[in-house]
């Protein structure tokens, strides 16, 4: 999906007001400094294409987040405010249902949230481009 | 400390597909980082080609994009290229490289294709 | 597409004299900017990010400066390992990440 034509601050204001509390809740107990972030975003549509992927795409050791209030959210803001989004999402939608049965919190997990969290924010930073 | 090592042939036929792989040591690709490649024609500047990250997003180069892929072994803990259709304007040294999704951390020593017949 | 053009194309300096590169770059790219080492049969080395932070175990000796379309690496005082060519590169327009044509550093 091309999130080029995304209402940006719209989704910003989904960000500050619920998924990054909700991304604070999930890493409740972390310290801030416990994991690196290796991995970062250039403009608008880069920084959603990688939180997309990173939010929704099981990874090694972590293949429990779609489920996450987090995760939700984001999926409802990329719907709502991406043109298109929704009719791109219905096959790993049904993919997801399958694949993921219950949420379980692992350390690789928390550090998945953690590049999250630095994806988020490199979003929202005032200077960065729209695309 | 990691380390990245290009290898594949050196000699690719016009209208050819050029395969590379890239072995990494001391670090696991789907732990961390994207996974880039990048090349430099003998004699001229650097040019990227694309990345996928840790967790298997991938992005290329418009100007390369309909050639491209860039896949991952990660039993290996290696990466590959592969660009078709290659013409004499795709010899180049290919290095592979560690990034941030930005700017390239780490880089393999380079490996050199040259496309002829 | 961001065009990346630097200069001087060649800089000959001695060991010990300071060196000024400058990278300019088509459009404002703020502060999303690389610079690189590549010294003759090797890859490049990552010297600076986000325009003006060293990367690990750069010497001090190096540092960056500018943003939006301006940009300058320097070299405050050239050691013999430091003749070199050096890229820019912007990694503000993604995908469309570009680099520098580079500027080589020779001994005069």
């Known amino acids: 999906y091309d999130f080029t034509n995304c209402d940006f601050e719209k989704i910003k204001a989904a960000y500050l007001s619920t998924i990054s509390k909700d991304l604070i809740t999930y890493m409740s107990g972390t310290k801030s400094t416990e994991f690196n972030n290796t991995v970062s975003c250039s403009n608008r549509p880069h920084c959603l294409t990688e939180i997309q992927s990173l939010t929704f795409n099981p990874t090694a050791g972590c293949a429990s987040l779609a489920k996450e209030m987090f995760a939700m959210k984001t999926k409802a803001a990329l719907a709502i405010w991406c043109p298109g989004y929704s009719e791109t999402q219905i096959n790993a939608t049904q993919a997801m249902k399958k694949a993921r049965k219950s949420k379980v919190t692992t350390n690789k997990c928390l550090e998945q949230v953690s590049q999250l969290q630095g994806l988020w924010r490199r979003f929202n930073r005032p200077l960065l481009k729209q695309q | 400390q990691v380390q990245l090592q290009e290898s594949g042939p050196g000699l690719v036929k016009p209208s050819e597909t050029l395969s590379l792989t890239c072995a990494v040591s001391?670090?696991?690709?789907?732990?961390?980082?994207?996974w880039s490649w990048i090349r430099q024609p003998p004699g001229k500047g650097l040019e990227w080609i694309g990345y996928?990250?840790?967790?298997?997003?991938?992005s290329y180069n418009p100007s390369l994009k309909s050639r491209v892929t860039i896949s991952r072994d990660t039993s290996k803990n290696q990466f590959s290229l592969k660009l078709s259709s290659v013409t004499a304007a795709d010899t180049a040294v290919y290095y592979c490289?560690?990034?941030?999704?930005?700017?390239?951390?780490?880089w393999g020593q380079g490996t050199l294709v040259t496309v002829s017949s | 597409e961001i065009v990346m053009t630097q200069s001087p194309a060649t800089l000959s300096l001695s060991p010990g004299e300071r060196a000024t590169l400058s990278c300019r770059a088509s459009?404002?790219?703020?502060?999303?900017l690389a610079w690189y080492q590549q010294k003759p049969g090797q890859a490049p080395r990552l010297l600076i990010y986000?325009?003006?932070s060293r990367a690990t175990g750069i010497p001090a000796r190096f540092s960056g400066s500018g943003s939006g379309t301006d940009f300058t690496l320097t070299i405050s005082s050239l050691e013999p390992e430091d003749f070199a060519v050096y890229y820019c590169?912007?990694?503000?327009?993604?995908?469309?990440?570009?680099f520098g044509q580079g500027t080589k550093v020779e001994i005069k």
């Open positions: 490289a560690r990034t941030n999704l930005l700017y390239f951390d780490s």
């Open positions: 986000d325009a003006s």
């Open positions: 590169q912007q990694y503000s327009n993604w995908p469309q990440y570009s």
């Open positions: 001391g670090y696991s690709i789907s732990s961390g980082y994207g």
């Open positions: 459009q404002s790219v703020s502060s999303n």
């Open positions: 996928f990250s840790y967790y298997g997003s991938t």
